[in-house]
């Protein structure tokens, strides 16, 4: 039975040209996290394997930095980076947990962080 919960940074916004940290946290389960995949809509951004560490998709090597922790830092943001991001936790024995973050990249200098929320 999957008892875990993923907490994410929720709906967030950032300035064009700036950077943002995407974070998820898995709680309420004793399952072992074997790998965390970060995806943007239908593209793979990065993988963090519990044993081997990070893999970054070639098309994002110049703009994605691993961490902090199991999170991901996006740099040199463009308006095209606006959209949904998913953290996918591969765990044993529970299976897969998915968290969602919506990022809005703003042209203006006003970029406020949204509230944190939970996805069961």
């Amino acid at each position: 039975m999957m008892t875990g919960t993923i907490e994410t940074t929720g709906n967030i916004s950032a300035e064009k040209g700036g950077s943002i940290i995407l974070q998820c946290h898995l709680s309420s389960t004793t399952a072992q996290v074997t790998q965390v995949n970060w995806e943007q809509q239908d593209q793979l951004l990065a993988i963090c394997n519990a044993d081997l560490g990070w893999h970054i998709s070639p098309s994002f090597k110049d703009r994605v930095a691993p961490g902090p922790g199991l999170g991901l830092t996006l740099q040199s943001l463009t308006v095209n980076d606006t959209g949904e991001y998913f953290c996918i936790y591969h765990t044993y024995p529970d299976g897969t947990y998915t968290g969602r973050i919506f990022l809005e990249v703003l042209e203006s200098s006003v970029a406020e962080h949204g509230a944190r929320f939970q996805i069961p």
Epitope: E39, L44, K61, V64
Partner: antibody, heavy 127, light 106 residues
Framework: EVQLQESGPGLVKPSETLSLTCTVS????????WGWIRQPPGKGLEWIGF???????SYNPSLKSRVTISVDTSKNQFSLKLSSVTAADTAVYYC?????????????????????WGQGTMVTVSS | DIQMTQSPSSLSASVGDRVTITCKAS??????LAWYQQKPGKAPKLLIY???SLQTGVPSRFSGSGSGTDFTLTISSLQPEDFATYYC????????FGGGTKVEIK
Amino acid sequence: EVQLQESGPGLVKPSETLSLTCTVSGGSISSDYWGWIRQPPGKGLEWIGFITYSGSTSYNPSLKSRVTISVDTSKNQFSLKLSSVTAADTAVYYCARMPSFITLASLSTWEGYFDFWGQGTMVTVSS
Amino acid sequence: DIQMTQSPSSLSASVGDRVTITCKASQSIHKNLAWYQQKPGKAPKLLIYYANSLQTGVPSRFSGSGSGTDFTLTISSLQPEDFATYYCQQYYSGWTFGGGTKVEIK
């Protein structure tokens, strides 16, 4: 160019431990990620496990309880031990490199594919 | 575990033919796929990585395409040295290989 060479006994008795060593030349083992893959006669490829230059390991879940991979940076070698072998472990064993690169965060990250392979060594499990 | 299914398992072709091999993943692996060529008694050789990137030194007649679950390796004009077995490999979640496709002389 990086070259890899497997070495070890070609015949192992059932229930014993298979031990192989891979020697890396033309490059330093203190970078990149290093793996073992096997191929039973007439069959496809199966990854066994990996080790990083720092000694972190990742094993195929189906073999995890029997596998140990270690690295000796002073000899530019990494090794495979597979315990409690049976006839099903008869295969050609390959060592290979999984390349890495440095990210914006100055961390080494793995690429996921195997760009340099040893020539393979046949290991038969039989009494 | 992600399963990789290659088709066909074998094919016969002539020198100069255009050859297409497909690989299907049991779930989306985005573009985290590599293709290898293996000749009898030899180690596999990397041809393509990240679904469509040609490895250094590999002839341009080899190309890869696809993303998600469906991938293709194409040899635009088969040469005598291309008769071999070809394997796909995913590295999206764990590492698994396809069953192989043997390309034989017609």
